[in-house]
Interface confidence: low
Amino acid sequence: QSGPLPKPSLQALPSSLVPLEKPVTLRCQGPPGVDLYRLEKLSSSRYQDQAVLFIPAMKRSLAGRYRCSYQNGSLWSLPSDQLELVATGVFAKPSLSAQPGPAVSSGGDVTLQCQTRYGFDQFALYKEGDPAPYKNPERWYRASFPIITVTAAHSGTYRCYSFSSRDPYLWSAPSDPLELVVTGTSVTPSRLPTEPPSPVAEFSEATAELTVSFTNEVFTTETSRSITASPKESDSPAGPARQYYTKGN
């Protein structure tokens, strides 16, 4: 065979967002008949020569970026896309609110606001989430997620997380759920887009606001000063699609 072997896939089951002390399985999948799998934790000099890593109880130290590859004979495959394994419940849950309120008319505007007492500069908004632990806070910080021209697709249950760009894989517990009700329409609600930006997307403006726009299951993230929050290709997450928005505050 000429050229490198094709890359395997790496996924986290049931999810790459894992509450502390909860189980998760990382699975590297290549073609049939692989001689050897190698699963590595990036930035830690650690790897194992097994395709499956079962973590019975998630720890902070296990959060981070993983990738895998495989060997057939003397040939190594290209590495898989990176998988970002996030420990949630490391910090207290933020609060999530809707302005002016959680009930909004189709075509109207609504802003989802995530607030935390920690000095976090990163926030993630989900249309569905996982529960996890708490911690004591210090100062108020917040992120605004304006949704312009609301449609029925925006109906659903939202949660947000907060975290620091210094420890991008250690997240708060999810906020309590916020049910967003869009009135005056009968269109079936849809899920959030499946290709989110990286959770470590950085914004150069400390007070930048994130605008979330939906158009046929495609969304963009841009600030009110037109700063684009697009992750570098090499940092893009792999595995099951993670349905969230992120913003730097």
Partner: antibody, heavy 125, light 107 residues
């Protein structure tokens, strides 16, 4: 599980020594081997570790350039070479082990559960 | 690096006495702490792992606990074979670091 370390070493300043730690009673390639330093009357310092299954190593920054960890799977033996010896390297060196995969690095149940008996290294002109 | 401050550095106690040794962590180590015994012949034995779990074969007079950043090893009733050196180890982050040790001597 047993870890049998090599005998005492007497070395000149500037020389190198290679200590061994022979493992038995378990699958050698499934366990990390760690090395520690204990100077007379002082505490313990962690030098680094090797995962024999892959040859992957991880060092304490303080010992980078001083210690080199290797492993021979065929003989289930881990080695630590100490180079450019000085009197500061005079100490007892221990190997210890625990089960290694990306979860078990952090699994306390096997962490440093088994130790070698130690090897005394004396550096003297 | 995480510093582990162990106290006392030495302790004289009598048979049957209850004693406690403490290690204070300079940063949060989230219960990632082991206790070891080093006998006079230099051999090491792990007593406690993950702050409070007793190793198999270790007598139940040994116990481990935590209060904030202080981690303690308690021996409820000293026996002659307990007189040795004791060390704590944190494995929350690299490099792993040990406490300075406690020499437990018979009074």
């Amino acid at each position: 599980v047993q870890l049998q370390q090599s005998g005492a070493e007497l070395a000149r300043p500037g020389a190198s020594v290679k200590l061994s730690c022979v493992a038995s009673g378990y699958t050698f390639t499934d366990y990390y081997v760690n090395w520690m330093k204990q100077r007379t009357g002082q505490g313990l310092e962690w030098i680094g570790e090797i995962y024999p299954g892959s040859g992957n190593t991880y060092y304490n920054e303080k010992f980078k350039g001083k210690a080199t960890l290797t492993a021979d799977k065929s003989s289930s033996t881990a080695y630590m070479q100490l180079s450019s010896l000085t009197s500061e390297d005079s100490a007892v060196y221990f190997c210890a082990t625990w089960r290694g995969n990306l979860y078990y690095d952090y699994d306390a149940e096997t962490l440093f559960a088994y130790w070698g008996q130690g090897t005394l290294v004396t550096v003297s002109a | 690096d995480i510093q582990m401050t162990q106290s006392p550095s030495s302790l004289s106690a009598s048979l049957g006495e209850r004693i406690s040794l403490t290690c204070r962590a300079s940063q949060d180590i989230s219960n990632y702490l082991n206790w070891f015994q080093q006998k006079p012949d230099g051999t090491f034995k792990r007593l406690i792992y993950a702050t409070s779990s007793l190793d198999s074969g270790v007598p139940k007079r040994f116990s481990g606990s935590r209060s904030g950043s202080d981690y303690s090893l308690t021996i409820s009733s000293l026996e002659s074979e307990d007189f040795a050196d004791y060390y704590c180890l944190q494995y929350a982050s690299y490099p792993y670091t040990f406490g300075g040790g406690t020499k437990l001597e018979i009074k």
